[in-house]
């Protein structure tokens, strides 16, 4: 719990509790925005991106995305708060220990999406389709 | 009982350095992910810097990157932050604070905190 000490500011959002009243601290992610990447049909990638950064709000969790248009594939690690939008997305897995990609609708290139809320957890992008979600098994495992 | 004890605050010129010590007792702290954090006044907490149990990995907010190290001797059970190239900005009450193998939860121990004051 926070103690008096610690003054609480208005519209705090540095400090955020857990329904047991205890101090949420913040994620570790990796964050080096967008990279050109040699992730290609593979059913896992590394990230290769050398920074963890803390994330600035302990709400927000590890993102990342992978595109591929007839020029280039990039990957983009970030962290970002899920209550907000995601290039246009909603992170609808964000609470997954594990960074699961899927596949968005964005016209002009392929686009997977993926968001996860353990430590580094977007330095492995998962495309695989043992992962998939829509299995209610598989749903208890992940988030075992 | 917890106790995380921090020391080496003060006043200090723009671009001086200062170096902080947190004593910790009452648990396990070389298991332990141990952090820095700040407050300035008026606003909220700032998440400044963490160190794994072990030392081996260290992690730190971008508006400190290259000017602050973080350490710990286990052997001490102190944690260090080294505070180079200070600006009037990082005037604020430096925390420290452990985060324990259960998670993300937790900070419930906190010291009193070192006022730290960079002005001319």
């Known amino acids: 719990t926070i103690p008096p000490h610690v003054q609480k500011s208005v519209n705090n959002d540095m400090i955020v509790t857990d329904n047991n009243g205890a101090v949420k601290f913040p994620q570790l992610c990796k964050f080096c925005d967008v990279r050109f990447s040699t992730c290609d049909n593979q059913k896992s990638c590394m990230s290769n991106c050398s920074i963890t950064s803390i994330c600035e709000k302990p709400q927000e969790v590890c993102v990342a995305v992978w595109r591929k248009n007839d020029e280039n594939i990039t990957l983009e690690t970030v962290c970002h708060d899920p209550k907000l939008p995601y290039h246009d997305f909603i992170l609808e897995d964000a609470a997954s220990p594990k960074c699961i990609m899927k596949e968005k609708k964005k016209p002009g290139e392929t686009f997977f999406m993926c968001s996860c809320s353990s430590d580094e957890c977007n330095d492995n992008i998962i495309f695989s389709e043992e992962y998939n979600t829509s299995n209610p098994d598989l749903l208890l495992v992940i988030f075992q | 009982e917890v106790q995380l004890l921090e020391s080496g605050g003060g006043l200090v010129q723009p671009g001086g350095s200062l170096r902080l010590s947190c004593a910790a007792s009452?648990?396990?702290?070389?298991?332990?992910r141990m952090w820095w954090v700040r407050q300035a006044p008026g606003k909220g907490l700032e998440w400044v810097s963490?160190?794994?149990?072990?030392?081996?990995?260290?992690y730190y907010a971008d508006s400190v990157k290259g000017r602050f190290t973080i350490s710990r001797d286990n052997s001490k059970n102190t944690l260090y932050l080294q505070m180079n190239s200070l600006r009037a900005e990082d005037t604020a009450v430096y925390y420290c604070?452990?985060?324990?193998?259960?998670?993300?939860?937790?900070?419930?121990?906190w010291g009193q905190g070192t006022l730290v004051t960079v002005s001319s």
């Open positions: 009452g648990f396990t702290f070389d298991q332990d």
């Open positions: 963490a160190i794994e149990s072990g030392g081996h990995r260290t």
């Open positions: 604070a452990n985060q324990n193998k259960s998670g993300r939860s937790g900070f419930d121990y």
